[in-house]
């Protein structure tokens, strides 16, 4: 502890200029004071001034007022410093002396004589308020006040608590009257050395080195570090923990970059045609009548569907067509006949059957012929039966579809998975991509088909901490660590939920 007992002398009265022994001072009592401060004694005794002692120069003659003086000789109030815990009790002896000698250092002069003395015993608490008192005897009167205050940086009821305000990286605080710390704005902790981060900053995923800051740990982002960073290269996916890539609906693949719903995302089929998804980036367009092409982008001639029957010839017009009918036929499509079976209207060996009591007829055609009069040879490719760009070929009475690579089925309607023939060696996992299959290899293998045995396994050095599982071939770093519960980080090196300002989690 450390403090100061302060004694303020205010007025001394010795009107008759008398000494304690009854003699008078000539020409007057040139007065100085001796002060002795010691531990509390019920009966004051001579002996060492255990709490300190001090003397003044000559302050006046006989009766005088003592002015405050802050420096030099004759300082008032008098200071009695101590370097211990203030006990709260004391004994004080104030003696007034007459000196015939030196004004400034009367203590050293011979022939000094006692004028009077007072003794005060009691309790005194530390505080700034002065206690005022006045002591009289038959000849003299002394007015004075006193107090105990703590030295700079000492606090508390007994001046025993040392506290120094500071504002550096070992603390940001001021001192309370009792010596406890009062943190400066933005700081907290026992020593006010922990910054208060931006309000809402995630406790585990963010930290700060100064107030109102939020610095994200690896794998996290956003103003409050509450958004995970997905796997590098993740295109159409999200994460709930860092480095994940959970695909959005309609997307697939390791990086969610394979379009499983090309029809919805890109609407490739034109002119009202129907789009059907068929694997990553695969689709087929089913055209409405009058359109053709991979995307049904080509408009057919209005006559392309051969609307004119019975040998009628078709002529395109701006938004429709016109049928020129052969003799014996009429109607928009030459569908009405003025002929009867008697006119032998059926060609190519077709059989004629009368209808409507002989007023019209119908031809039954032999195989490979069609039309109202069996006048057309059958072309089984006119309906564009082959999907996915397959080529249609007439083979006598039937037709076949010649499919493009990657498609099969009678109408080339089935997509062949590149992974169906298991191209990945050594237990690799196959992923269908637009440009062919891609293999994700198990630890110890690499290459496009996992056919190369790795002599240096990226997992062999044990890069993953805290019991994490190591996988190779999943990332550009050649390995990925799958963390156990309670650990995070690219190598699972950071435990979750360390002290408030711990730097890491994944």
């Amino acid at each position: 502890g450390s403090g100061i007992f302060q004694l303020r002398l205010q007025e001394f009265v010795n009107q008759r200029g008398m000494l304690a022994n009854g003699q008078s001072c000539e020409p007057g009592c040139r007065t100085f004071f001796r002060i002795c401060l010691k531990h509390f004694q019920a009966t004051f005794s001579e002996g060492p001034c255990t709490f300190g002692n001090v003397s003044t120069p000559v302050l006046g003659t006989n009766s005088f007022v003592v002015r405050d003086k802050n420096s030099g000789s004759g300082r008032n109030p008098l200071q009695l410093p101590f370097n211990f815990t203030w006990p709260g009790t004391f004994s004080l002896n104030i003696q007034a002396w007459h000196t015939p000698g030196d004004d400034l250092r009367p203590e050293t002069s011979p022939g000094n004589s006692l004028i009077s003395q007072i003794i005060i015993q009691g309790s005194l608490a530390v505080g700034k308020i002065w206690r005022t008192d006045e002591q009289n005897d038959t000849l003299t009167r002394l007015s004075y006040s006193y107090r105990v205050i703590c030295s700079d940086n000492y606090y508390g009821e007994s001046c025993s608590r040392l506290c120094k305000k500071r504002d550096d990286h070992f603390g940001h605080y001021e001192c309370q009257p009792d010596g406890s710390l009062s943190c400066l704005p933005g700081w907290t902790g026992k020593y006010c050395d922990q910054p208060i981060c931006l309000s809402g900053c995630h406790e585990q995923n963010g930290y700060c080195s100064k107030p109102d800051e939020c610095i994200c740990r690896p794998g996290w982002q956003g103003r409050l570090c509450n958004e995970c960073i997905p796997h590098n290269g993740c295109r159409h996916g999200t994460c709930s923990i860092p480095w994940q890539c959970a695909c959005d609906e309609g997307w697939g693949g390791l990086f969610c970059d394979q379009d499983l719903n090309y029809c919805t995302h890109h609407s490739p089929c034109k002119n009202g045609s129907t789009c059907s998804n068929s694997g990553p980036k695969g689709y087929t367009c089913t055209c409405l009548p009058g359109y053709t092409g991979e995307h049904c982008e080509l408009g057919l001639s209005k006559c392309a569907s051969n609307p004119c029957r019975n040998g009628g010839s078709c002529k395109d017009q701006e938004n429709s067509y016109h049928c020129l009918c052969p003799p014996g036929y009429y109607g928009q499509h030459c569908e009405h006949s003025t002929l009867t079976c008697a006119d032998s209207p059926c060609f190519n060996g077709g059989s004629c059957r009368e209808r409507n009591q002989g007023s019209s007829y119908a031809c039954e055609c032999p195989p490979n012929f069609t039309g109202s009069n069996c006048e057309k040879k059958v072309d089984r490719c006119t309906s564009n039966p082959c999907a996915n760009g397959g080529q249609c070929q007439n083979r006598g009475p039937s037709r076949t579809c010649r499919c493009r690579p990657g498609f099969t089925g009678t109408h080339c309607e089935l997509h062949i998975s590149d992974c169906a023939r298991s191209p990945c060696a050594h237990g690799g996992t196959c992923h269908d991509l637009e440009n062919g299959p891609v293999c994700t290899c198990p630890a110890g293998f690499s290459g496009r088909r996992c056919e190369v045995r790795i002599t240096h396994d990226a997992c062999a050095s044990g890069p993953c901490f805290n019991g994490a599982t190591c996988y190779t071939g999943l990332s550009p770093n050649n390995f990925v660590c799958n963390c156990p519960y309670g650990f995070v980080g690219s190598r699972c090196e950071f435990p979750v939920g360390l002290p408030p300002s711990f730097p890491w989690v994944a």
Partner: antibody, heavy 121, light 106 residues
Framework: EVQLQESGPGLVKPSETLSLTCTVS??????????WGWIRQPPGKGLEWIGD???????YYNPSLKSRVTISVDTSKNQFSLKLSSVTAADTAVYYC?????????????WGQGTLVTVSS | SYELTQPPSVSVSPGQTASITCSGQ??????ASWYQQKPGQSPVLVIY???KRPSGIPERFSGSNSGDTATLTISGTQPMDEADYYC?????????FGYGTKVTVL
């Protein structure tokens, strides 16, 4: 009981970069109660504080060396490091790593044994 | 920049009291630490926060700090106390060491 061990080359050529690492054992570098620092002592001379670092990466440097000093921390390895660039013969010294304790008002009760680095061609 | 000044040397007879001073502008408003360093050894903290002793440091080591001066006192000095002593303080975020005082036990 926490122990500190300095490591790094004992000889560095002038104008090159001095690199030292301090490995912490017997305790975590990620404690919120400590700063981890470097102090040097040229032969026959006094101690000079170089700088210190908190486990989060906050650094504090001696203004007279600031332009040449970098201190970094690797919590996964329980290590912190010192890099001093463009060295001259005046940088020849015993380099100590130390732990400064917040509860000791910034006093350091744990020091490494020191490593002598000589700058000479 | 902030400086701490110490006397280069102090001599003391065994059993006597050695006082080492450390002066700096308003040093009393900062916490002072004291380190003992023997030849070929790392420094050892003997006083922190002006007057507190770490565990294991003998009671004969004491410290005070007020005004512009911090003082390390070794009472009943022993031959084993012969060493270099450094005061240290923090000026904002910068660590500052005194120049050191060599204590010789005669």
């Amino acid at each position: 009981e926490v122990q500190l061990q300095e490591s790094g080359p004992g000889l560095v050529k002038p104008s090159e970069t001095l690199s030292l690492t301090c490995t912490v054992s017997g305790g975590s570098i990620s404690s919120s109660s400590y700063y981890w620092g470097w102090i040097r002592q040229p032969p026959g001379k006094g101690l000079e504080w170089i700088g210190d670092i908190y486990y989060t990466g906050s650094t504090y440097y001696n203004p007279s060396l600031k332009s040449r000093v970098t201190i970094s921390v690797d919590t996964s390895k329980n290590q912190f490091s010192l890099k001093l660039s463009s060295v001259t013969a005046a940088d020849t010294a015993v380099y100590y790593c130390a732990r400064f304790d917040v509860s000791l008002g910034g006093g350091s009760d744990t020091w490494g044994q020191g490593t002598l680095v000589t700058v000479s061609s | 920049s902030y400086e701490l000044t110490q006397p280069p040397s102090v001599s003391v007879s065994p059993g006597q009291t050695a006082s080492i001073t450390c002066s700096g502008q308003r040093l009393g408003d900062k916490y002072a630490s004291w380190y003992q360093q023997k030849p070929g050894q790392s420094p050892v903290l003997v006083i922190y926060e002006d007057s507190k002793r770490p565990s294991g440091i003998p009671e004969r080591f004491s410290g005070s700090n007020s005004g512009d001066t911090a003082t390390l006192t070794i009472s009943g000095t022993q031959p084993m106390d012969e060493a270099d002593y450094y005061c240290q303080a923090w000026d904002r975020d910068t660590g500052v060491f005194g120049y050191g005082t060599k204590v010789t036990v005669l």
